[in-house]
Interface confidence: low
């Protein structure tokens, strides 16, 4: 239904508080370097304008599209050219090209200072002094660092952030109450951002069909009792929501997400028996809860898949009549029977089935040709099963830190051209699959592990896309979304790599390492490990382990010394010499 004024429509639907928050997120995700105060000023101007349109939808400019209104506002920023360089050229374009231009300039790794957490008392004072500004600052800082963060979900995080401060700033031990809550929000926030980044990459790089296939598989696993028509409707609506959010249309996205949650709750009897608790919650919690809801039980009376998709004489007829619908039905039927498979595996099976039908339906005897198609699935299923089994055994043997180190070595040897910070970040996250998924029973391991690895490898892909340095990474990232993980798994040591020149400065450490948190100290050691492998890609596990053990002992010794700095200088030289000898550098 057309509205005379889109901005008035969204303001009324969302309410002033959510409207302002979403406009702030949108602006911070576009202009990631702008100061907080500048964004707040722009948001206030847009909000005042929206209110005039609510009062009179025929008022001047109220009929303009949101892209036009927001783009015009962003282009009023005085320092656009100095701060953003060529992004300023976007302002010379007309909509919709201008918005596309802004989207292309979103930076997944903006050059922003790390967020340092102030003392608890300082934060509580700031919270009490001006709660509204404090919460806006949270939205701004997260949004500019995570330009694809799922905006309606960020509102949910902000609600929890506010609740944490409200509760803990009046607790007897503020720090004990607040810090674990903030840690949890930080970790969940990073995970949420990465998951959404994959959805946006799927839509933007591989198209709507790829995203819809993912959604059919995931929703069919989650709602196995729902009819195919119901799942298809949910997929269409969910695709619209994510297309909007990934496209910067945050007001429409939040509004449509709320409508989808409402629909799901009104029709839960035909969707899932697990939705009852979610549907009793307020809007933001409800939407989050639905997105995370556990898989419903499988219906008891599901017939064999072979009857409709292999044994039937109408397979090619059905396929020819409506290819995507027939493949969608196959994916739905397979996924609802297999909550124990990862979504990417289900998509590989569907792709194999599609390829077989394309070939066989043109053959002399189609049925004879595709009769054994399900046999082709066996190796595809076994590959991730075996990989997960091996890696969980390794994780259980080594523990998280050493498992991360094994992956650091493995991935640095595969793609040594990738920057050290990216290799450290990605390998650390890959290593977290152990603690996240290996504790699960076998029926839940593969969906947990392989779908998580898809999210982490997408981080590598988007960071690498900004500064491409490896043809192998580009190939694995662009050829097939569902085969990214098998592609990276299959990479061997890069024999074409010319080892990096040895630089003693890279391995020079100072007393400041002693005051770092355990996590930061691990990152320092893992950075050194990556550099070692880049210098000596043919080093054996045993050689690297020996050097890393010596390095750990060196840090421990010097951090206990009276004159730490002297110890780091003198013992560091000895360590570098010993390491060079051990590795033949």
């Amino acid at each position: 239904d057309a509205h005379k004024s889109e901005v008035a429509h969204r303001f009324k639907d969302l309410g002033e508080e959510n409207f302002k928050a979403l406009v702030l997120i949108a602006f911070a995700q576009y202009l990631q370097q702008c100061p907080f105060e500048d964004h707040v000023k722009l948001v206030n101007e847009v909000t005042e304008f929206a209110k005039t349109c609510v009062a009179d939808e025929s008022a001047e400019n109220c009929d303009k599209s949101l892209h036009t209104l927001f783009g015009d506002k962003l282009c009023t920023v005085a320092t656009l050219r100095e701060t953003y360089g060529e992004m300023a050229d976007c302002c010379a374009k007309q909509e919709p090209e201008r918005n596309e231009c802004f989207l292309q300039h979103k930076d997944d790794n903006p050059n922003l200072p790390r967020l340092v957490r102030p003392e608890v008392d300082v934060m509580c004072t700031a919270f009490h002094d001006n709660e509204e500004t404090f919460l806006k600052k949270y939205l701004y800082e997260i949004a500019r660092r995570h330009p694809y963060f799922y905006a309606p979900e960020l509102l949910f995080f902000a609600k929890r952030y506010k609740a944490a401060f409200t509760e803990c700033c009046q607790a007897a031990d503020k720090a004990a109450c607040l810090l674990p809550k903030l840690d949890e929000l930080r970790d969940e926030g990073k995970a949420s951002s990465a998951k959404q980044r994959l959805k946006c990459a799927s839509l933007q790089k591989f198209g709507e069909r790829a995203f819809k296939a993912w959604a059919v598989a995931r929703l069919s696993q989650r709602f196995p009792k729902a009819e195919f028509a119901e799942v298809s409707k949910l997929v269409t609506d969910l695709t619209k929501v994510h297309t909007e959010c990934c496209h910067g249309d945050l007001l429409e996205c939040a509004d449509d997400r709320a409508d989808l949650a409402k629909y799901i709750c009104e029709n839960q009897d035909s969707i899932s028996s697990k939705l009852k608790e979610c549907c009793e919650k307020p809007l933001l919690e409800k939407s989050h809860c639905i997105a995370e809801v556990e898989n419903d039980e499988m219906p008891a009376d599901l017939p064999s898949l072979a009857a409709d998709f292999v044994e039937s004489k109408d397979v090619c007829k059905n396929y020819a009549e409506a290819k995507d619908v027939f493949l969608g039905m196959f994916l739905y039927e397979y996924a609802r029977r297999h909550p124990d498979y990862s979504v990417v595996l289900l998509l590989r099976l569907a792709k194999t089935y599609e390829t077989t039908l394309e070939k066989c339906c043109a053959a002399a005897d189609p049925h004879e040709c595709y009769a054994k198609v399900f046999d082709e699935f066996k190796p595809l299923v076994e590959e991730p099963q075996n990989l997960i089994k091996q890696n969980c055994e390794l994780f259980e043997q080594l523990g998280e830190y050493k498992f991360q180190n094994a992956l650091l070595v493995r991935y640095t040897k595969k793609v040594p051209q990738v920057s050290t910070p990216t290799l450290v970040e990605v390998s650390r996250n890959l290593g977290k699959v152990g603690s996240k998924c290996c504790k699960h029973p076998e029926a839940k391991r593969m969906p947990c592990a392989e779908d998580y690895l898809s999210v982490v490898l997408n981080q590598l892909c988007v960071l690498h896309e900004k500064t491409p340095v490896s043809d192998r990474v580009t190939k694995c990232c662009t050829e097939s979304l569902v085969n990214r993980r098998p592609c990276f798994s299959a990479l061997e040591v890069d024999e074409t790599y010319v080892p990096k020149e040895f630089n003693a400065e890279t391995f020079t450490f100072h007393a400041d390492i002693c005051t770092l948190s355990e996590k930061e100290r691990q990152i320092k050691k893992q950075t050194a490990l990556v550099e070692l492998v880049k210098h000596k890609p043919k080093a054996t596990k045993e050689q690297l382990k020996a050097v890393m053990d010596d390095f750990a002992a060196f840090v421990e010794k010097c951090c206990k010394a009276d004159d730490k700095e002297t110890c780091f200088a003198e013992e560091g030289k000895k360590l570098v010499a010993a390491s060079q000898a051990a590795l033949g550098l």
Partner: nanobody
């Protein structure tokens, strides 16, 4: 590989009871709905009963409703069929299947109801 092994069949008088078991291996039993199917001599397979993966939802063929009870123990990877008030027409080979398939994937266990 997927394996389903039935046991508990035998000869019983009309009105008597039997409890069939089906031990599963080679797949994630707790993720799948399961069924009992039977095949009488000279007849095609007939679906008897089904249970969902969690054990909450059960279904029965009209011919056995009120007399048979399907259950499962996911920890033991075992499916059960408690058969009470048995009739001569219940005589058949009983076998378990994954989902609601009636395609035989196992040897089955013979149940004979006769006086």
């Amino acid at each position: 590989e997927v394996q389903l092994v039935e046991s508990g069949g035998g000869l019983v008088q009309p009105g008597g009871s039997l409890r069939l078991s089906c031990a599963a291996s080679g797949f994630t039993f707790g993720s799948f709905g399961m069924s009992w199917v039977r095949q009488a001599p000279g007849k095609g397979p007939e679906w008897v009963s089904a249970i969902d993966s969690g054990g909450a939802d059960t279904r029965y063929a009209e011919s056995v409703k009120g007399r048979f009870t399907i259950s499962r123990d996911n920890a033991k990877k075992t499916l059960y069929l408690q058969m009470n008030s048995l009739k001569p027409e219940d005589t058949a080979v009983y076998y378990c299947t994954i989902g609601r398939s009636t395609s035989r994937g196992s040897q089955g266990t013979q149940v004979t109801v006769s006086s």
